[in-house]
């Protein structure tokens, strides 16, 4: 779970080790702030959950990747 | 059937810039990513970055930050890597290898690659 | 970076003999590995991705198996026509890492 201090920084601690499938997450936002200790993915899920990911996994690249392509690709 | 075609063999100066493209062809090309490989004559394989055309997003190699610049045209579904400020240390083969997604299902690995591309940097 | 140790680095086997190849992952990289034949002046050819499942029109000589940080690689009955490097890489967590490479000769 995500964690803020001294909000409005959200930081990871720990990342999730299982992998999620992609049907279940709505959207992501990267965690670049050089008050975290360490740089992360926020997956929220359909469901509102949000969830820390290691940004280096493959899996978590290819979810953003498709989070951003249906983004970008009109529904029609 | 797919093919990836890379340009072909560069002679450049130390100091200088090249740009090396990879033309895909047989299969829909915002749906694979493209990685580059670095590879020196009798030597290893190092993986350089990977582009994803669907979207532009790039992953590098933090060894490769600043080297090189991954960019991809989907109108020609032609991938390109340029790489800067060349030194010895970057002549090499370079080669292109498309690569699935793992969400999406069509993932197997770097299942094709193009011939490669021969930099040699030399004064 | 996740460092790949595969050994050997060099096999010198006869036709006809069965041959493993052993790689290690310095942190556990799941079942995110695949294998890769490289002959004398061609570009790398996939072989086995996710550890152990074969690629298509690959040959069932061979094989892949591992889970976690200990992969091996195996041709069961070596051919003249396997005269190649084969790498080991893993795509768990970036950057992709391949191990150094074995050369298989045969005698």
């Known amino acids: 779970q995500p964690d803020a201090i001294n909000a409005p920084v959200t930081c990871c601690y720990n990342f999730t080790n299982r992998k999620i499938s992609v049907q279940r997450l709505a959207s992501y936002r990267r965690i670049t702030s050089s008050k975290c200790p360490k740089e992360a993915v926020i997956f929220k899920t359909i469901v509102a959950k949000e969830i820390c990911a290691d940004p280096k996994q493959k899996w978590v690249q290819d979810s953003m990747d498709h989070l951003d392509k249906q983004t970008q690709t009109p529904k029609t | 059937q797919v093919q990836l075609k890379q340009s072909g063999a560069e002679l450049v100066r130390p100091g200088a810039s090249v740009k090396l493209s990879c033309k895909a062809s047989g299969y829909t090309f915002t749906d694979y990513y493209i990685n580059w490989v670095k590879q020196r004559p009798g030597q290893g394989l190092e993986w350089i970055a990977r582009i994803y055309p669907g979207t532009g997003n790039t992953y590098y190699n933090e060894n490769f930050k600043g080297k090189a610049t991954l960019t991809a045209e989907k109108s020609s579904s032609t991938a390109y890597m340029q790489l800067s400020s060349l030194t010895s240390e970057d002549s090499a083969v370079y080669f292109c290898a498309r690569s699935g997604s793992t969400v999406v299902g069509n993932y197997y690995g770097m299942d094709y690659w193009g011939q490669g591309t021969s930099v040699t940097v030399s004064s | 970076s996740i460092v790949m140790t595969q050994t050997p680095k060099f096999l010198l086997v006869s036709a006809g003999d069965r041959v493993s190849i052993t790689c290690k992952a310095s942190?556990?990289?799941?079942?995110?590995v695949a294998w890769y034949q490289q002959k004398p002046g061609q570009s790398p050819k996939l072989l086995i991705y996710?550890?152990?499942n074969r690629y298509t029109g690959v040959p069932d000589r061979f094989t892949g198996s591992g889970y976690g940080t200990d992969f091996t690689f195996t041709i069961s009955t070596v051919q003249a026509e396997d005269l190649a490097v084969y790498f080991c890489q893993q795509d768990y967590s970036s950057p992709w890492t391949f191990g150094g490479g074995t050369k298989l000769e045969i005698k």
């Open positions: 942190q556990s990289v799941s079942n995110d």
């Open positions: 996710y550890a152990s």
